[in-house]
């Protein structure tokens, strides 16, 4: 019990436009719907596909969609099947075609006074209505002795005469639309007294000093006149020739011969035929002087064995177009084989090492010959001459790792350190032969190095481990002058490294032993409580078996570190008054005082008349101005240490006393009053 709610219906359709055949089904069970075209299942395509149960056409095609469509619904469980009514398209279309000669059989047979029939090959459905045109003007039935049938597609001219000559085209229309002829027909029916071309001159290319011949013939009844002209419209005859055409000869049959052609002879030659009636017939031909330019240079080429490569030879500009061929070792290449020429290309299929060498591209025409060489190298995979080897390099000295290879072309060598590409800098240098030089070897240069040698054919690589032989050195070297604070605990470190762990000891420079309150603990000199007598010169000695010993001299100074006795205070001063910023420091050696005002050091030699720094370190500023406001820093320093302290200076306007304020009332700020 499959029921169709909608059946497809036959309908008009337009070629190339959308269409839809509807089908809607109801059934007790699940059904699948498919379509038949003339009894065969319809396969979905982008153009024609099922949409739900309906069949959709994106673009109707008069060839593929002609026939009877049927919608089929099938219940796969019960096997029940129902088929819709048949539906088909009445497809409307129109298709352009050429205008062709139907009668006589060929153009050569068209003679004056014969019947000529043209056929318009525009087809369509419904059958189109035709309209004929001569030189773009519509023709109507019975017009000027021609019979036109618009029902049929034929145009009959009876009889055909010169007045019928022209370009014939046709258009047709039907319910689909309009189309015009894709190719038109030129009908030429000559008047016997008109000059007609028998032989037309052709363009000629000649080499300098060669000869050129132009042929030209016309026929007419009575016979026509023939005349030759050169570019400047100067007539060429055997009696009167222009100066630059002294070597021109016009023959009785109309041919023009030019001997010993020069560049000034190049140009357009016109052959003019004039009949008793009708317009003159002008034929043109050009005389070109042969020429050939130079060929561009080839870059040398590097190819790999086994590959297929092509080298294109760009022919030089020339007239006529130069012919191109390739040669190798003086022998022209064949057009097939393993190494051959194809068009302008040199083809090397499955390259062998023996293919290396110079190949020459030749180009030639009437003007001469040109050639250009290309050097072809067949790359080989590098081979080892000397691989890098595990090496022991001395710290601080230059070290070398070798990577010597050979190949064609010369290989390029790159080095990697810990898988990182080494870029040449002040410490690394790669020589032309591939050797790596490490300038001033450092401890951390001890790692893996890999060199890669490459050509276009392939690469080889090898790696080596570098072990750095450390020199005996202090790490870090002790400071040559150091201060210790009097009556405090102090330490002076000394450490060193070498190939073997060095032993470290301290001694006084004069050789005397260290006092009992000074200990040497694994290279660290320890003063439990610094005395004045601890000042002096000390030597740190680092030594090991293989490398001997090294010494570092240290001068120790005992100092009382700086403290401030008086520090500057936050100060507010009336404009025009004097500001005093006090600063006093003590220490041993006796500290020097410097002042910094508004982020610059105040140089005592360049202070000017308003500022002065006293021996005790205090800073006085006379006649203060608002721009003197800011932070002032007192810096106390000696050879052992440096300390600083700072305070702000504010410069304010003196207030005008108000009536409400009693005499002697205090100012609103903590002031320095001078």
């Amino acid at each position: 019990a499959i029921v169709f709610i909608k059946q497809p219906s036959s309908q008009d359709a337009l070629q190339g436009r959308r269409a839809l055949l509807r089908c809607e089904v109801e059934a007790p069970g699940l059904v699948h719907v498919y379509w038949l075209l003339d009894g065969a299942p319809v396969q979905d395509t982008e153009r024609r596909f099922t949409q739900g149960s309906s069949l959709s056409f994106a673009a109707v095609d008069r060839l593929q969609d002609s026939g009877t469509f049927q919608c089929v619904a099938r219940d796969d469980v019960t096997g029940e099947e129902a088929r819709s009514a048949n539906a088909s398209f009445n497809i409307k279309w129109i298709e352009a075609g050429p205008v062709v000669l139907k009668h006589p059989a060929s153009e050569a047979e068209i003679q004056p006074q014969t019947q000529v029939t043209l056929r318009c090959h525009i087809d369509g459905h419904p059958r189109p209505t035709y309209q004929w045109f001569r030189d773009g003007t519509p023709l109507s039935d019975g017009q000027s002795n021609n019979t036109v049938s618009s029902k049929e597609r034929n145009l009959t001219l009876r009889p055909a005469g010169p007045e019928h000559s022209g370009l014939y085209s046709c258009c047709a229309h039907n319910a689909f639309g309009q189309a015009c002829s894709s190719q038109n027909f030129t009908l030429s029916i000559a008047d016997e007294s008109f000059a007609r071309v028998v032989l037309a001159p052709q363009d000629v290319i000649v080499a300098r000093n060669e000869e050129a011949m132009f042929h030209c013939q016309f026929s007419a009844q009575p016979p026509p006149n023939l005349q030759w002209l050169f570019e400047d419209e100067t007539p060429i005859t055997n009696r009167s020739r222009p100066p630059h055409l002294r070597r021109a000869t016009v023959f009785a049959n109309g041919s023009l011969l030019l001997t010993q052609v020069r560049p000034r002879n190049a140009g357009v030659y016109r052959c003019i035929g004039q009949g008793q009636r009708g317009p003159p017939v002008i034929l043109e031909a050009t005389l070109h002087l042969a020429e050939i330019e130079d060929m561009p240079l080839f870059e040398p080429r590097v190819f790999t064995a086994g590959s297929e490569e092509r080298v294109t030879c760009l022919p030089p500009k020339g007239l006529p177009e130069p012919s191109v061929w390739w040669e190798h070792a003086g022998v022209r290449l064949p057009t097939h084989g393993r190494v051959y020429q194809k068009g302008h290309e040199l083809v090397l299929a499955s390259i062998a090492e023996s293919d290396a060498g110079v190949y020459t591209c030749h180009a030639a025409n009437l003007a001469g010959q040109r050639r250009q060489d290309v050097n072809i190298t067949v790359a080989t995979v590098p081979t080892w001459l000397k691989k890098p080897q595990d090496s022991q390099l001395e710290e601080g000295k230059p070290g070398y790792l070798h990577c010597l290879t050979q190949a064609t072309p010369k290989p390029t060598v790159v080095w990697y350190r810990n898988q990182m590409l080494i870029s040449e800098d002040s410490r690394f240098e790669v020589f032309k032969n591939g050797t790596l030089r490490i300038n001033n070897v450092e401890v951390y240069d001890g790692t893996w190095y890999r060199c890669v040698s490459s050509t276009p054919a392939g690469s080889i690589e090898a790696q080596a481990r570098v072990q750095v032989l450390e020199k005996l050195k202090f790490t870090p070297p002790p400071q040559p002058q150091q201060c210790m604070e009097f009556d405090k605990e102090a330490t002076v470190p000394c450490s060193a490294t070498g190939r073997e762990k060095p032993t470290i000891k301290w001694e006084r420079a004069d050789g005397s032993s260290l006092p009992e309150w000074v200990t040497d603990n694994a290279g660290t000199l320890h003063f439990a409580r610094v005395t004045r007598d601890d000042a002096g010169n000390y030597t740190c000695i680092a030594s090991n078996g293989p490398q001997g010993q090294i010494r570092a001299h240290v001068q120790l100074t005992v100092a009382v570190f700086i403290t401030f006795k008086v520090e500057p205070e936050r100060t507010t001063v009336y404009q025009g008054h004097t500001a005093l910023l006090q600063c006093e420091a003590q220490g041993d050696p006796k500290p020097l005082i410097q002042w910094k005002g508004k982020d610059r050091i105040l140089d005592p030699t360049k202070l000017g008349p308003r500022m002065h720094i006293f021996q005790n370190g205090s800073l006085v500023i006379h006649d203060v101005a608002p721009e003197d406001s800011g932070r002032y820093t007192c810096i106390a320093g000696n050879s052992c240490n440096i300390k600083h302290t700072e305070a702000p200076l504010y410069v304010v306007d003196k207030p005008v006393p108000e009536e409400s304020e009693g005499p002697g009332s205090p100012p609103p700020y903590k002031m320095i009053q001078t």
């Epitope: 019990a1 029921v3 909608k6 109801e26 059934a27 069970g29 059904v31």
Partner: antibody, heavy 122, light 107 residues
Framework: EVQLVESGGGLVQPGGSLKLSCAAS????????MHWVRQASGKGLEWVGR??????????TYAASVKGRFTISRDDSKNTAYLQMNSLKTEDTAVYYC?????????????WGQGTLVSVSS | DIQMTQSPSSLSASVGDRVTITCRAS??????LNWYQQKPGKAPKLLIY???NLDKGVPSGFSGSGSGTDFTFTISSLQPEHIATYYC?????????FGQGTRLEIK
């Protein structure tokens, strides 16, 4: 003989509910879509909605005027279609017909019930 | 929704006259159009399906034509039993819609 018999009509207040039944016999009910059509007194025919067959997953479609208030269902084992009407309005007053149509083979069929009157009034 | 415009809404003709009713769809409905006859107090009865096909048992005096948007229903010779209201109905697209009806009476 094909028969469609509607029942369940009557008087109901606005906002009330009513369920109409349509009992089918004499044709393969399970393979047909069922439609409901109504006709107010002295007025034209108005399509109410449709329920499709199992082949089309019992899909339902409704007229805009009843969407959200009316529900069509069916029971193929009882050869019966239903129209559940909720939130009834006075303008729902009409004779309600159930109907079925389509091609069986190449013959078109168009079956209508005798109709049942629904009056919505306070 | 597809609007169906039926004309005339009523017409009076003599027995034996040829009667024509037209129906216009607001968009192309192909040939998915039915014509119904409804007599007072009765359910509608199908006369023409798919625009031009006569239903089984319907006299040949009824006919339909048209495709796309314009459709015509014709009674070739009016008889007294033809007094009724006639409706066109499209089922190309849901919702199914009816014309407003044409009431036919005899002069």
């Amino acid at each position: 003989e094909v028969q469609l018999v509607e029942s369940g009509g009557g008087l109901v207040q606005p906002g009330g509910s009513l369920k109409l039944s349509c009992a089918a016999s004499g044709f393969t009910f399970s393979g047909c879509a069922m439609h409901w059509v109504r006709q107010a007194s002295g007025k034209g025919l108005e399509w109410v909605g449709r329920i499709r067959s199992k082949a089309n997953n019992y899909a339902t479609t409704y007229a805009a005027s009843v969407k959200g208030r009316f529900t069509i269902s069916r029971d193929d084992s009882k050869n019966t279609a239903y129209l559940q009407m909720n939130s009834l309005k006075t303008e729902d007053t009409a004779v309600y017909y159930c109907t079925s149509r389509g091609y069986s083979g190449f013959d078109w069929f168009d079956y209508w019930g005798q109709g049942t009157l629904v009056s919505v009034s306070s | 929704d597809i609007q169906m415009t039926q004309s005339p809404s009523s017409l009076s003709a003599s027995v034996g006259d040829r009667v024509t009713i037209t129906c216009r769809a607001s968009q192309d409905i192909s040939n998915y159009l039915n014509w119904y006859q409804q007599k007072p107090g009765k359910a509608p009865k199908l006369l023409i399906y798919d625009a031009s096909n006569l239903d089984k048992g319907v006299p040949s005096g009824f006919s339909g034509s048209g495709s796309g948007t314009d459709f015509t229903f014709t009674i070739s010779s009016l008889q007294p039993e033809h007094i009724a209201t006639y409706y066109c109905q499209q089922y190309d697209n849901l919702p199914i819609t009816f014309g407003q009806g044409t009431r036919l009476e005899i002069k």
